[in-house]
Interface confidence: low
């Protein structure tokens, strides 16, 4: 059959599975006169033969692991043995079968992990190799934990990345592992080829011994420091320590102080750097962080709490220059005149701020000294001997000594003797009629003026009038302010009026004195007055319980998923209808009746990490008033972006001919959120046929090296496809291409004759 199994001499490629018995011919080449016979040369390895009549065949089983590609040359010879056609390249590709077992590089691995390590963060790797072709399932390895010892209640504390062999803690392991309880674990890990998906796959196992080590990165106990220390500063107050040497420590001050009075050294010792003042700040909270040599945090910061302990460094102080009390002429022995108070800046409810009061002087001393008493700790001032008379003295000046355990302060107290309070306040009108106000009347507005009079001694507590609302204002929407000169009462709005809850109210005022009435005199109906307040409705906008609503969803949330709910209430009780504004990407819709918000399109964190829309609530019916709140949809990252090259790598070149194998370095990145973990990319050539010429080797999680394997390259441009895998959940693989030009160089740059200047590379390697 011409074409498939026979034909003229020309360059050809054949694919043959390894391990197959040599039972059939590969191809029948036809000789064109004067050619009468053929000659086969190159990498025949004694396996490939050609008969005189052009029959190409192999004599032994092929082994891909010995040679994956055989490069042969075939020539047609005349009867004298001279070449009349060719030689042409004949390539035999040996196709892989799964004839090699995966093998772990070690029969036993040992590793250690700190308790509370982050779940999913690798702390060790196991590695296996398989001689089969990694570009086929035969050489694709799948790692698995087969046994965990001990294993309680079937809970796995360890997990393995089935592609990379990275071992990390599960969330349960991160929480439960405790070196005190059990520091030793053993895993049996298996590796299978065929990606672990075939019952005929080969496997190997290895043993992994894991030691759980204590996590010593812990917040220290709260520290107590006495204020105003006179010892030389800095003074060590506590210490933190990272699990391994070499950490760089620093303090984070969240409280904006003019001077931050703490420091940390590189042993993790924390110092107070200056005396502290409890009266300025009674406690400090700051954070200690540990970072690696690149300035990257090794763990979460630790909270350091410092309590400043009080010392008695403040004397008592008088609350005012003179404190004035009033006492009526007729008051009896023991009557309370008032409570005298001073202040101490030291810590409350502490020995340093407990004050004692003592009367040390009375002027005048008529009719006798010691007319007054003061309670030693309470400060209550009482009549100590008998009733006072204005004719003896209308005023007494007392000196009060206030002391704490170390300091004494003198304060002045003036006691005025006033007429007896035997007259009650009397309202000029008992009924102030009615008034109608709208519910949006401004706070502070005076809505009514009331007046009562009192015939007791003017400008004393016996004649001063205090107005109280004793009925009809349970919500405290009104207040009465008294003019001290005229005793006029101004009724003002203190809180917004509300038609919906109190449309009509009967208000009752009472006029009373700060001084007690004498025995036998009582307030009567003359001291009370009434007033009716009617509130009219103002249509109010719907009210949201908060101005910003927030929901967190994964960016791969299905279209139509409910992502949140926003509600508003109309003060008049009207139905509210909801709509969205500024829905600029059209990602959301809202149920106009319930306020439920749904996704209407694929969400993408890389486009918008927080999607913000306005929600409008509008009254249905009425005057269609509306109000607005914000809905913030926080999109959580999903590994949905393949890796890519971090920058533009056009213009890469090698000078031709290569004098030695060369290499170049490139960097990968991807658009997924990298805050949780640094990228851990793996790199591979994108075509198997490139492996004889090129090699990609990983430098770290983001960088790799592309190297030439020999120096025999043509003077041309090579496009090298490279696969970059991010190892995420799910893993994403990006295919990128590096264009490398092999060119003649002048002064280390590519040389092109004039007129052929298109796309000259600019970077030499």
């Amino acid at each position: 059959q011409e074409g498939k199994f026979s034909g003229p001499l020309k360059p050809m490629t054949f694919s043959i599975f390894e391990g197959q018995e040599p039972s059939q011919i590969i191809f029948q080449f036809k000789a064109n006169p004067p050619a009468v016979t053929f000659e086969l040369t190159g990498e025949t390895d004694g396996i490939f033969k050609i008969e005189k009549d052009g029959l190409l065949y192999h004599t032994r089983v092929l082994d891909r692991e010995t040679r994956a590609v055989h490069h042969l040359q075939l020539a047609a010879l005349d009867s004298q043995g001279a070449i009349v056609d060719g030689p042409v390249p004949i390539i035999i590709e040996v196709k892989d079968i799964n004839d090699n077992r995966p093998t772990f590089l070690q029969t036993k691995y040992e590793g250690s992990v700190r308790q509370n390590s982050r779940p999913g963060k690798p702390f060790m790797y196991v590695n296996a190799t398989d001689l089969d072709d990694p570009a086929t399932p035969n050489g694709q390895l799948f790692y698995q934990i087969v046994i965990q010892l001990p294993k309680i209640n079937n809970v796995m504390y360890f997990q393995i990345d089935n592609k990379t062999g990275a071992i990390s803690l599960t969330p349960e392991g991160s929480q439960v592992l405790d070196p005190i309880k059990n520091p030793y674990y053993n895993l049996v890990v298996s590796v299978k080829d065929m990606g672990g998906q075939n019952e005929n796959s080969f496997s190997d196992t290895t043993s992994v011994d894991i030691t759980v080590r204590e996590n010593i990165w812990k917040a220290p106990e709260p520290v107590e420091i006495r204020e105003n220390l006179t010892d030389p500063h800095p003074i060590k107050i506590t210490q933190v320590q990272w699990n391994d040497p070499g950490a760089h420590y620093s303090l984070i001050n969240k409280e904006k102080l003019p001077q931050f009075p703490f420091s940390i050294d590189q042993e993790g010792n924390i110092y107070v750097t200056q005396p502290l003042d409890r009266e300025e700040k009674d406690s400090h909270v700051f954070f200690a962080t540990a970072k690696d040599e690149n300035g990257k945090p090794l763990a979460y910061p630790l909270e350091i709490r410092v309590k400043v302990i009080d010392i008695n460094d403040n004397p008592p102080t008088c609350l005012s220059q003179v404190t004035v009390f009033e006492v009526q002429e007729n008051e009896v022995l023991g009557s309370s005149i008032g409570i005298f108070a001073a202040h101490d800046m030291d810590e409350a409810n502490n020995i340093n701020s407990i004050l004692k009061y003592r009367l040390v002087d009375q002027t005048p001393k008529v009719p006798s000294d010691e007319l007054f008493l003061i309670d030693e700790y309470g400060g209550k001032v009482q009549l100590g001997k008998r009733s006072l008379k204005k004719q003896d003295s209308p005023q007494y000046n007392l000196t009060v000594e206030v002391s704490d355990i170390d300091f004494k302060t003198l304060c002045s107290l003036q006691v005025n003797v006033i007429d007896i309070n035997d007259q009650i306040p009397i309202f000029e009108r008992s009924d102030y009629g009615s008034k109608t106000l709208s519910e949006d009347t401004a706070i502070g507005s005076t809505i009514l003026i009331i007046q009562a009079t009192d015939d007791d001694e003017p400008f004393t507590g016996s004649s001063k009038i205090l107005y109280k609302i004793v009925q009809g204002d349970t919500e405290g929407r009104l207040e009465v302010v008294t003019d001290p000169m005229t005793n006029t009462g101004y009724v003002k709005i203190r809180k917004p009026l509300d038609f919906e809850t109190e449309p009509v109210t009967s208000i009752v005022f009472k006029a009373e004195n700060p001084e007690p009435l004498v025995n036998g005199i009582e307030y009567n109906a003359s001291s009370f007055a009434s007033f009716e307040l009617t509130v009219t409705d103002v249509n109010e906008v719907p009210v949201f319980p908060q101005q910003i609503f927030q929901a967190n969803v994964s960016e791969d949330t299905a279209i139509g998923t409910k992502v949140g709910t926003v509600t508003a209430r109309d003060p008049e009780g009207l139905t509210v209808s909801y709509s969205l504004k500024d829905n600029k990407r059209g990602w959301l819709k809202i149920d106009s009746v319930t306020g439920d918000i749904f996704s209407t399109a694929p969400l993408d964190r890389e486009t918008e990490s927080v999607y913000r829309v306005q929600v409008v609530a509008t009254e249905v019916g009425g005057s269609s008033l509306s109000s607005t709140a914000y809905f913030h949809l926080v999109l959580m990252d999903v590994n949905d972006n393949p890796p890519r090259l971090a920058k533009d790598y056009t213009g890469l070149f090698f000078c031709h001919p290569l004098s030695a194998p060369g290499s170049l370095i490139f960097e990968a990145t991807d658009d997924d959120q990298q805050s949780v973990r640094r990228p851990k990319f793996t790199f591979a050539l994108g075509r198997e046929s490139l492996q004889s010429d090129w090699e990609v080797s990983k430098i770290n999680g983001t960088h790799a090296r592309l190297s030439t394997k020999h120096t025999r390259f043509e003077e041309q441009v090579y496009d090298i496809p490279i696969l970059i895998n991010d190892g995420g959940q799910p893993p994403m693989e990006g295919i990128v291409s590096l264009s490398v030009t092999f060119c003649q160089c002048v002064d280390g740059s590519c040389f092109r004759p004039a007129g052929n200047q298109v796309g000259i590379p600019t970077v030499g390697m």
């Epitope: 209640n153 809970v155 969330p171 349960e172 929480q175 439960v176 405790d178 005190i180 309880k181």
Partner: antibody, heavy 120, light 105 residues
Framework: QVQLVQSGAEVKKPGASVKVSCKAS????????MNWVRQAPGQGLEWMGV????????GYAQKFQGRVTMTVDKSTSTAYMELSSLRSEDTAVYYC?????????????WGQGTTVTVSS | DIQLTQSPSSLSASVGDRVTITCRAT?????IHWYQQKPGKAPKPLIY???KLASGVPSRFSGSGSGTDYTLTISSLQPEDFATYYC????????FGQGTKLEIK
């Protein structure tokens, strides 16, 4: 079978302290965490803290830090919870609850509860 | 700390009804547990790690959910199921939902 038996009801004045005991039997006391959970009248459950009898390791809920002390007596397989500076809102039923072996956040066995009343 | 909100707070149902109680967390959780409490008694574990039945719990109880939203379902109510149900989040420090009281209609 696993049993947790708690001490009897207590009536305390505001400012006082109360110490509730929880005697464990039917399992190895030091192998399991002991949690304390309280329930005010007509209210829900509130986790107070945990102690690991093997090592004496403790973890308290922020709300009770400074007022609660959890201890164990390994010789009698008894856990204790002491709450100081009592106030009326501490009136509640206090439960001890065993944390399941490998994972102390699942409470598999509970005591019968101890009623503590704080009243002046 | 993570807060849990159960809904409804109370519900009336009849024997044979299918009942669903939900528990919503303020941030994403790996696991949640459910407890049943009868008046004057200590709570009992019902479902742990979202959907696993505690020992001795009938199969009419089931649990599901992920992330922040979890559900307890009783497929056919029995007289002994009238009680208060609590969800509890597994992250330290542990918190409970406010409870759902299931009463006879």
């Amino acid at each position: 079978q696993v049993q947790l038996v708690q001490s009897g009801a207590e009536v305390k004045k505001p400012g006082a302290s109360v110490k509730v005991s929880c005697k464990a039997s039917g399992y190895t006391f030091t192998d399991y965490y002991m949690n304390w959970v309280r329930q005010a009248p007509g209210q829900g459950l509130e986790w107070m803290g945990v102690i690991y009898p093997y090592s004496g390791g403790i973890g308290y809920a922020q709300k009770f830090q400074g007022r609660v002390t959890m201890t164990v007596d390994k010789s009698t397989s008894t856990a204790y919870m002491e709450l100081s500076s009592l106030r009326s809102e501490d009136t509640a039923v206090y439960y001890c609850a065993r944390g399941r072996g490998d994972y102390f956040g699942l409470f598999d066995f509970w005591g019968q509860g101890t009623t503590v009343t704080v009243s002046s | 700390d993570i807060q849990l909100t159960q809904s409804p707070s109370s519900l009336s149902a009849s024997v044979g009804d299918r009942v669903t109680i939900t528990c919503r967390a303020t941030s994403s959780l790996s696991y949640i547990h459910w407890y049943q409490q009868k008046p004057g008694k200590a709570p009992k574990p019902l479902i742990y790690e979202i959907s696993k039945l505690a020992s001795g719990v009938p199969s009419r109880f089931s649990g599901s959910g992920s992330g922040t939203d979890y559900t307890l379902t009783i497929s056919s109510l029995q007289p002994e199921d009238f009680a208060t149900y609590y969800c509890q989040q597994w992250n330290y420090p542990f918190t409970f939902g406010q409870g759902t009281k299931l009463e006879i209609k």
